[in-house]
């Protein structure tokens, strides 16, 4: 687990959970609405989504030097998406089916974020999405865009944890 002293996370656990997240993100993507995406939605919520970038220390060298920078960035992204999936974009109309993968996806995001940051250790959460209510007609497109960007995010995170599990595990 990543603790204030900067010790390594449970790379193998993180790898397994991030792979599950990838699967869930892909299975959730086509199942977010009742109709075709005919109306353009507001870009505001999806413009500011977190991306893992070159300077975040998620490359092999950066992970070797100090994995905490990358892990903090991944943690921030997980919290951001977890809050989006709990917002009315996903909990409002058109209602998702009770067995929608979005529920599992949401829980897994929370699970991985807790694995990276156990109780009592608090990283700064820089990006918190705006939670002002979304209009119902915007939500299908917003869901589509959020899940698409989440797919990209968890794909990179999964690669990071796969590398960590293979080369950085004790």
């Amino acid at each position: 687990r990543a603790v204030p002293g900067g010790s390594s996370p449970a790379w193998t656990q993180c790898q397994q959970l991030s792979q599950k997240l990838c699967t869930l993100a892909w299975s959730a993507h086509p199942l977010v609405g009742h109709m075709d995406l005919r109306e353009e939605g507001d870009e505001e919520t999806t413009n500011d989504v977190p991306h893992i970038q070159c300077g975040d220390g998620c490359d092999p060298q950066g992970l070797r030097d100090n994995s905490q920078f990358c892990l903090q960035r991944i943690h921030q992204g997980l919290i951001f998406y977890e809050k989006l999936l709990g917002s009315d974009i996903f909990t409002g109309e058109p209602s998702l089916l009770p067995d929608s993968p979005v529920g599992q996806l949401h829980a897994s995001l929370l699970g991985l974020s807790q694995l990276l940051q156990p109780e009592g250790h608090h990283w700064e959460t820089q990006q918190i999405p705006s939670l002002s209510p979304s209009q119902p007609w915007q939500r299908l497109l917003l869901r589509f865009k959020i899940l698409r960007s989440l797919q990209a995010f968890v794909a990179v995170a999964a690669r990071v944890f796969a590398h960590g599990a293979a080369t950085l595990s004790p």
């Epitope: 109709m35 917002s87 009315d88 909990t91 009770p98 209009q135």
Partner: antibody
């Protein structure tokens, strides 16, 4: 089976406040917003707003801002609505509804009378 | 706010009749429209969502059509138990608004 069980009727004096509840069962409470709808005797339906039980963020109809306060309690899977500064105009049946308005509570009758 | 207008206000029909209830929105709402039935002293019951999607447990004689701003609820063979008030609702944008209702009576 999804069920919404609302609290019992209320007889309240003008100027007072009242708080009613809607206990949800049969589904994951935090996965869907909970709506509240007003119906005056012999009249139509009016949407008050909803609460998102996951993050406790409400969304109000402008006509009910300052009148209704929506809250939720995850531990008991219960949504609540408090109405303040009651007048005779607030005498109505109040419903909670969830999941694309598919499931409705039985309603709570509020009577405002001196 | 989007204004929902229903017509007629009252409809008196004979069992077995096919009836159509109309709902018009003051602006286009795509197919974000709900239909409800409310019997006396009961909670509203959802009949149709998203203009034409049927609801589990609702008799197949109820159907919905329309898109944009004009919508219709059809009952293809009215039964005596269909008496009540029928409401349409804008589900497109906030605040959600309801029509004034159509009261269905049996002759």
């Amino acid at each position: 089976e999804v069920q919404l069980q609302q609290s019992g009727p209320e007889l309240v004096k003008p100027g007072a406040s009242v708080k009613m509840s809607c206990k949800a069962s049969g589904y994951t409470f935090t996965r869907y917003v909970m709506h509240w709808v007003k119906q005056k005797p012999g009249q139509g339906l009016e949407w008050i707003g909803y609460i998102n039980p996951y993050n406790d963020v409400p969304n109000y109809n402008e006509n009910f801002k300052g009148k209704a306060t929506l809250t939720s309690d995850k531990s008991s899977s219960t949504a609540s609505m408090e109405l303040s500064s009651l007048t005779s105009e607030d005498s109505a049946v109040y419903y909670c509804a969830v999941w694309d308005f598919t499931y409705w509570g039985q309603g709570t009758l509020v009577t405002v009378s001196a | 706010d989007i204004v929902m207008t229903q017509s007629p206000a009252t409809l008196s029909v004979t069992p077995g009749d096919r009836v159509s209830l109309s709902c018009r929105a003051s602006q286009r709402i795509s197919d974000y429209l709900y239909w409800y039935q409310q019997k006396s002293h009961e909670s509203p019951r959802l009949l149709i969502k998203y203009a034409s999607q049927s609801i589990s447990g609702i008799p197949s004689r109820f159907s919905g059509s329309g898109s944009g701003s004009d919508f219709t609820l059809s009952i293809n063979s009215v039964e005596p138990e269909d008496v009540g008030v029928y409401y349409c609702q804008n589900g497109h944008s906030f605040p959600y608004t309801f029509g004034g209702g159509t009261k269905l009576e049996i002759k």
